[in-house]
């Protein structure tokens, strides 16, 4: 019952005389374990005997006996799933059908496997992709339907008989599905490989040749070209002729069109293999190549650089950078089309030839003011000297130079004058656009660079200006030297250091803070009267009569200044004391009499004492002594004493006469 036996193995196995065969095989006997196995060579069923006839290559029975001649053939299987076989060595007459007769307790099966043994090693087979294009990687495959554990082999790739450098990957398969040895080679063919022979060589383990397969490469590629030029160096002068020829060294498939290119651009109406250029001009200098196309694409030749030589063209100057700040670096570049390149340059500044520089580039590390101007140049090569083209302007910029502050007024300047100053400079680039002044003040600038100071102060000492373009340059400060009358005139007491007492030596100083000019005169005045012309006013022995309001005047050529009035105060003890009587020195009894102690004192009398004709002090201490009612016995001589912080003074005697009233006389 066939449904009970399932076999898997290659349908046919290939080998050659002396090699070996390894037959991978699996089976499934559904009704139990294998009890008997016979390997037949070309088995034939005998209907009469109901058995198979044929050469028995291997036999395994229940008792496990195997004939000794069966050692060449090995059953490597087992009783239930593996039926792998090995024949080593294999012989030519092993070709044919192998029959695997399998018997279990209840079932039998004959499985057939084809064996193809050749006399000599058969060749491998090279497989190529359908199309090969240059520079596109392809995989070359060499396949041999053989592999056996007992017989190692190798596959080697050759190109035109020479081993290929690329590393091949060899793989083997010994499975129930397939038995083979395969070598794969990755390879990027070039156009030059077209038509070349590739060989896959089968070798034994010692590298001995067994067989091979060869193929011829068909590498599709764009046309490969060679360009030839007359003259060969491609260097000509204007007016000469040039011939270029394009030769196709290889093309697969055949080429279809031809064209010529200059500097990458196609030349019109040039579709032959020869390009003729007659009476060339410098514009025809450039890189030439020919282009030939086939179905793969266009192929280009190497470029030929055609140099049409000519004398330099009129030159131009490029300046890096203008305008330039004085002290900065500047580079001049002389640009002139010429072939060959100019070997010598002549530089001009403002039309005059400049010596010392013959290079294309002139580098000035730190620019100077006289470098400003127009620069031009002339280039020279072996064919001649060019012309001077238009010049380039170098603008050298710098801050205003030699800035000065100038006083426009006639000198000297007096306090209160209107002063006009101007800010002058020698040169400036760019132009001066504004001015600055120090110190800052509420002054007017009637015009650019002019400063007007109305009512100039005595203390306006120096003024400085700056002229400004992109930078400001300051002038040295100029002294206004303003002249003015003496200032801050005041009277100062030098001695004594304390209060002035009558009889003291006194010195007064006339002080002032400043004067310009310095030469001054002094005047002392009291109550409109001139006292002296020195800076000091001296009193050897001051008297109270010297007290009063003093002023000093200081004058110079500009004017005079008076001090504030200064009060001179003389301190003295009470003096000129006298007793005055009111209503008179003769008073009728019963009336009122007032005695007043009059004095001259500084400070004023602070304490009075009254005395009678007996020099007896009276108990009265005010300036006035009031007697009311006055009595006859009050008659007599009185005097008073005055006291202040300086001292005392006394009056002379003054007599008071009190006479009787008519009533008193009448009573008598």
């Amino acid at each position: 019952d066939s449904s009970k036996w399932v076999f898997e193995h290659p349908e046919t196995l290939y080998a050659w005389e002396g090699a070996c065969v390894w037959i991978p095989c699996t089976y499934r006997a559904l009704d139990g374990d294998l009890e008997s196995f016979i390997l037949f060579h070309n088995p034939e069923y005998n209907k009469n005997t109901s058995k198979f006839d044929g050469t028995r290559l291997y036999e395994s029975t229940k008792d496990g006996k195997v004939p000794s001649e069966q050692k060449r053939v090995q059953f490597l299987g087992d009783k239930n799933k593996n039926c792998t076989l090995s024949i080593h060595p294999v012989h030519l007459n092993d070709s044919g059908q192998l029959g695997l007769r399998m018997e279990s307790k209840t079932e039998k099966w004959m499985e057939r496997i084809h064996l193809n043994v050749s006399e000599r090693p058969f060749p491998p087979h090279i497989q190529l992709p359908p199309e090969i294009q240059e520079s596109q990687e392809v995989t070359l495959t060499c396949l041999l339907n053989f592999s056996c554990y007992g017989y190692p082999i190798q596959l080697q790739w050759l190109l035109e008989g020479v081993p290929m450098r690329q590393a091949a990957v060899t793989s083997t398969s010994l499975t129930i599905k397939s038995v083979f040895t395969r070598s794969e080679l990755k390879f990027s063919p070039q156009w030059s490989h077209h038509g070349k022979i590739v060989t896959c060589q089968l070798q034994d383990a010692d590298g001995k040749f067994l067989s091979n397969d060869t193929v011829q490469l068909n590498v599709k590629h764009t046309p490969k070209l060679e360009i030839k030029v007359t003259p060969s160096d491609a260097i000509v002068r204007e007016g000469d002729s040039v011939t270029m020829t394009c030769e196709v060294s290889s093309s697969n498939p055949e080429y279809t069109t031809v064209s010529w290119l200059k500097d990458g651009t196609s030349l019109k109406k040039q579709n032959t293999f020869t390009l003729n250029l007659r009476e060339v001009t410098k514009d025809q200098s450039g890189k030439y190549c020919c282009q030939v196309s086939n179905d793969v694409g266009p192929g280009r030749s190497e470029e030929v650089f055609l140099q049409v030589q000519y004398a330099p063209e009129p030159s131009t100057v490029q300046i890096l950078h203008s305008p330039a700040v004085e002290g900065s670096q500047v580079e001049f570049l002389c640009m002139s089309l010429a072939n060959p390149l100019p070997t010598n340059y002549t530089w001009y500044h403002n039309g005059k030839e400049m010596q010392g520089r013959t290079e294309e580039k002139v580098h000035i590390p730190k620019i100077l003011p006289w470098h400003a101007g127009t620069y031009s140049c002339v280039a020279e090569n072996i064919l001649g000297t060019g012309q001077r083209g238009p010049g380039a302007e170098l603008d050298v910029q710098y801050p205003p130079k030699k800035v000065t502050t100038v006083i426009q007024n006639p000198m000297p300047i007096r306090e209160g004058d209107t002063v006009t100053l101007s800010c002058n400079y020698n040169s400036s680039n760019p132009s001066v656009t504004r001015y600055e002044w120090k110190p800052h003040g509420a002054w007017e600038e009637p015009s650019l660079g002019v400063l007007k100071i109305q009512n100039v102060g005595w203390d306006n000492t120096t003024i400085a200006c700056a002229a400004c373009n992109s930078w400001c340059s300051w002038a040295s400060p100029v002294a206004l030297n303003v002249q003015y009358a003496p200032r801050d005139v005041r009277v100062r007491k030098i001695k004594p250091l304390s209060e002035i007492h009558s009889g003291n030596s006194v010195s007064l100083q006339c002080d002032f803070s400043s004067s310009h000019p310095k030469e001054v005169q002094f005047f002392w005045e009291k109550n409109g009267r001139l006292l002296g012309k020195e800076s000091q006013l001296n009193f050897d022995s001051i008297s109270p009569e010297d007290a009063g309001s003093y002023s000093c005047w200081v004058n110079n050529s500009i004017g005079q200044t008076a001090s504030k009035a200064w009060t001179l105060e003389v301190l003295y003890a009470p003096r000129r004391l006298r007793v005055s009587m009111s209503p008179g020195d003769q008073v009728m009894e019963g009336k009122s009499a007032t005695l007043t102690c009059e004095s001259d004192a500084n400070p004023p009398v602070s304490h009075y004492t009254w005395f009678d004709w007996n020099n007896q002090s009276l108990p009265y201490h005010s300036q006035k002594l009031r007697l009311e009612p006055v009595k006859v016995q009050h008659s007599g001589a009185y005097w008073c004493q005055g006291t202040n912080s300086v001292g005392k003074g006394r009056s002379p005697l003054s007599t008071l006469t009190v006479y009787y009233s008519p009533e008193t006389i009448g009573r008598r």
């Epitope: 004085e326 010596q355 010392g356 730190k366 100077l368 006289w370 470098h371 801050p399 030699k402 040169s427």
Partner: antibody, heavy 119, light 107 residues
């Protein structure tokens, strides 16, 4: 060979005048800026005046401004220095010098002529 | 503008001499150096801070930055004994300015 030869020096009284000349040869005189530089006996170098190749640009030291005048005659390959109101402090060896336009340095000097201002 | 040079510098033969030239922000200016031997006119030794005219030995070199320019003479020889002057263009006054000079003595 570049040559600069000064002449015109000598003894002069204070307040007097002298005209120095410099004859140039061995180079294209009209292409070069020129200077006068002086050196008082035993002292250092002092720049006096400078003139551009065409004569359009002229600079003077403050110490001589208003008294000295630089000029040139390109046709005669000559440089001049007119010195007026001479003072004792103007006593020096006066060098005629060729300037390098590009760097401003003095690349050639004459041998100098001595000017003595004394009463 | 004032250029300050040391009055004298002494150096042994074969050694290196350094002569300085000081000035405010001198690094922004072109500095030139002149050599003057007794009784002779000056000779340009260095221009553009560090360039050497033809005929001046490679032993002579210059540098300039900040507030100091320097003339360096390596492997000094007896023939280098001379006065050395630095020079700049003062753009604020439009004047050439020379340093006071340095007397180089070879010991």
């Amino acid at each position: 060979e570049v040559q600069l030869v000064e002449s015109g020096g000598g003894l002069v009284k204070p307040g007097g005048s002298l005209r120095l000349s410099c004859a140039a040869s061995g180079f294209t005189f009209s292409d070069y800026y020129m200077s006068w530089i002086r050196q008082a006996p035993g002292k250092g170098l002092e720049w006096v005046s400078y003139i551009s190749s065409s004569g359009s640009t002229i600079y003077y030291a403050d110490s001589v401004k208003g008294r000295f005048t630089i000029s040139r005659d390109n046709a005669k390959n000559s440089l001049y220095l007119q010195m007026n109101s001479l003072r004792a402090e103007d006593t020096a060896v006066y060098y005629c010098a060729r300037d390098d336009f590009w760097s401003g340095s003095v690349d050639y000097w004459g041998q100098g002529t001595l000017v003595t201002v004394s009463s | 503008y004032v250029l300050t040079q040391p009055p004298s510098v002494s150096v042994a033969p074969g050694k290196t001499a350094t002569i300085t030239c000081g000035g405010t922000n001198i690094g922004s200016k072109n500095v030139h150096w002149y050599q003057q031997k007794p009784g002779q006119a000056p000779v340009l030794a260095i221009y553009y801070d560090s360039d050497r005219p033809s005929g001046i030995p490679e032993r002579f070199s210059g540098s300039n930055s900040g507030n100091t320019a320097t003339l360096t003479i390596s492997r000094v020889e007896a023939g280098d004994e001379a006065d050395y002057f630095c020079q700049v263009w003062d753009s604020s006054s439009d004047h050439w300015v020379f340093g006071g000079g340095t007397k180089l003595t070879v010991l």
